[in-house]
C-alpha cells in the first residue's frame, strides 16, 4: 500500500493540426491514472481516455461533431492501486484545459504541391485538397470543404536562377502564374486563413521546381 | 472462442483472505481492461475496480481501497482479485469481467462464470 | 459517486408486449450508459452499449435511448427467454456504478 499522493495535472495543452486534435499533460504518472472529460460550453461531460497511464488523449472523435464549438477539456487523476487520494471530501482531483475553438485554432498542416502544368507563358498549380477527419454523410471532408472560402493558399515562385520571388493568391486550390517560355521556375505553397487571430499560416510546402517529375510541358 | 474462467468456490472466515483468478482465452489479453465485479446474494452489482493486464495498472472503488489487490500473470494470461480482512458482508459471486474495445472500453462485453465466496465462522 | 436509480423495481409483463424500464443519473453522464441482462444463476450479458448501441448478436428487439440524465431500455416484444434481472451502468465517472436492477417476469 502506496503513501504518494495523488497530484492535479498540469501543462494541459491542444494539439491541433487540421483538426487533428490530442489534449497533452503533465506530469508522468506516478502511482495514478487519469482520465479525460470533454465538453462544449452548452454540452455534457464526455469521458474518454479511462484509467490510462498516458499523458496525452486523442479527443478528435469529439472536436469533429461540430469545429465551430468552443470546447473545454478537463483531466481527472486517480489513484493507481491502494494509493491514498488527496481529493477532498472524495472529491477526484481534476485540471481544467483553455478553451479550444477548432474552427479557430487547429493549425493548418502543410500543404503540397499536387501538380503543375506549364501551357506556353502560363503555369498551372495545383494544391493537394487535403482530407480532414471531420466527417459529414459518413464521408471526410477536404480542408476547402471545411473552410471553404476562408481559406487562401499563397504561392511563392521565382527563377530558378535567381533568388527574387513572386507572389500569388488563391481562394480555391489552383494557380495560374505568368512565367517566361523557356526558364525554369521553382514555387512552394503555403495555406492561410487570414480571418484568423491565431495560427494563421501553415508551414511552407516542399519546394518543387519545373523540369522535375510533378510537371507537364507543353508548348 | 472469447472466454473467461474462473476458480471455483470459497469457504472463508472472517478475518481471512481470499484470491480468486480469471484465465482468459481467445483473444489478446494484453489489449483489453478486465474488471471486477461481485453480487451479494440477492443484490445488485457493484464495481470493485480495474486491472490493464498490458502493464499491470490498477484502479480500485474507494470502498475497496486498501482491502483489494488485483493482479496479472501475462505467461498465463490470468487476472487475481485479492480480499482481505473478509467480513461477512463480502459474501458474493465476484465476477471477472472484461472491458470492451475502444469503441465501448467500459461496457463488460465479456463476463466470467463467477465465484462463490462465502465468509462464515 | 454517482447514483443510477433504476425503476421499476420489478415489473410483469405478457408475451408480446413492449416492456420499458429507465434509469436516472444523478448528474449528467452524457452518453457513457450500458445495460445488461442477467438470469438467474448466471452472469449479466451486454445488450447495448453507450446508451443506444446494440451489442453485436443481440436481437433487434432490445433498444436504448437518452433524454438529459434519463435513459431507457425496452424491449419491443417481450418473449419468454427474456425472463431476467436488467441493470443499467455507468461509467463517465469514477467509480463505475450499477443501478438497482430491474426483475422482468411473465404474467
Known amino acids: 500500500s502506496g503513501t504518494t499522493n495523488t497530484v492535479a495535472a498540469y501543462n494541459l495543452t491542444w494539439k491541433s493540426t487540421n483538426f487533428k486534435t490530442i489534449l497533452e499533460w503533465e506530469p508522468k504518472p506516478v502511482n495514478q491514472v487519469y482520465t479525460v472529460q470533454i465538453s462544449t460550453k452548452s454540452g455534457d461531460w464526455k469521458s474518454k481516455c479511462f484509467y490510462t497511464t498516458d499523458t496525452e488523449c486523442d479527443l478528435t472523435d469529439e472536436i469533429v461533431k461540430d469545429v465551430k464549438q468552443t470546447y473545454l477539456a478537463r483531466v481527472f487523476s486517480y489513484p493507481a492501486g491502494n494509493v491514498e487520494s488527496t481529493g477532498s471530501a472524495g472529491e477526484p482531483l481534476y485540471e481544467n484545459s483553455p478553451e479550444f475553438t477548432p474552427y479557430l485554432e487547429t493549425n493548418l498542416g502543410q500543404p503540397t504541391i499536387q501538380s503543375f502544368e506549364q501551357v506556353g507563358t502560363k503555369v498551372n498549380v495545383t494544391v493537394e485538397d487535403e482530407r480532414t477527419l471531420v466527417r459529414r454523410n459518413n464521408t471526410f471532408l477536404s480542408l476547402r470543404d471545411v473552410f471553404g472560402k476562408d481559406l487562401i493558399y499563397t504561392l511563392y515562385y521565382w527563377k530558378s536562377s535567381s533568388s527574387g520571388k513572386k507572389t500569388a493568391k488563391t481562394n480555391t486550390n489552383e494557380f495560374l502564374i505568368d512565367v517566361e517560355k523557356g526558364v525554369s521556375y521553382c514555387f512552394f505553397a503555403q495555406a492561410v486563413i487570414p480571418s484568423r487571430t491565431v495560427n494563421r499560416k501553415s508551414t511552407d510546402s516542399p519546394v518543387e521546381c519545373m523540369g522535375q517529375e510533378k510537371g507537364e510541358f507543353r508548348e | 472462442q472469447v472466454q473467461l474462467v474462473q476458480s471455483g468456490a470459497e469457504v472463508k472466515k472472517p478475518g481471512a483472505s481470499v484470491k480468486v483468478s480469471c484465465k482468459a482465452s481467445?483473444?489478446?489479453?494484453?489489449?483489453?481492461?478486465m474488471h471486477w465485479v461481485r453480487q451479494a446474494p440477492g443484490q445488485g452489482l457493484e464495481w470493485m475496480g480495474i486491472i490493464n493486464p498490458s502493464g499491470g495498472i490498477t484502479v480500485y472503488a474507494q470502498k475497496f481501497q486498501g482491502r483489494v489487490t488485483m493482479t496479472r500473470d501475462t505467461s498465463t494470461s490470468t487476472v487475481y482479485m485479492e480480499l482481505s480482512s473478509l467480513r461477512s458482508e463480502d459474501t458474493a459471486v465476484y465476477y471477472c469481467?472484461?472491458?470492451?474495445?475502444?469503441?465501448?472500453?467500459?461496457?463488460?462485453?465479456?463476463w466470467g462464470q463467477g465465484t462463490m465466496v462465502t465468509v462464515s465462522s | 459517486d454517482i447514483q443510477m436509480t433504476q425503476s421499476p423495481s420489478s415489473l410483469s409483463a405478457s408475451v408480446g408486449d413492449r416492456v420499458t424500464i429507465t434509469c436516472q443519473a444523478s448528474q449528467d453522464i452524457s452518453n457513457s450508459l450500458n445495460w445488461y441482462q442477467q438470469k438467474p444463476g448466471k452472469a449479466p450479458k451486454l445488450l447495448i452499449y453507450d446508451a443506444s448501441n446494440l451489442e453485436t448478436g443481440v436481437p433487434s428487439r432490445f433498444s436504448g435511448s437518452r433524454s438529459g440524465t434519463d435513459f431507457t431500455f425496452t424491449i419491443s416484444s417481450l418473449q419468454p427467454e427474456d425472463i431476467a434481472t436488467y441493470y443499467c451502468q455507468q461509467y463517465n465517472f469514477h467509480p463505475l456504478t450499477f443501478g438497482g436492477g430491474t426483475k422482468v417476469e411473465i404474467k
Open positions: 469481467a472484461r472491458g470492451g474495445s475502444k469503441v465501448a472500453a467500459l461496457a463488460f462485453d465479456i
Open positions: 481467445g483473444y489478446t489479453f494484453a489489449n483489453y481492461y
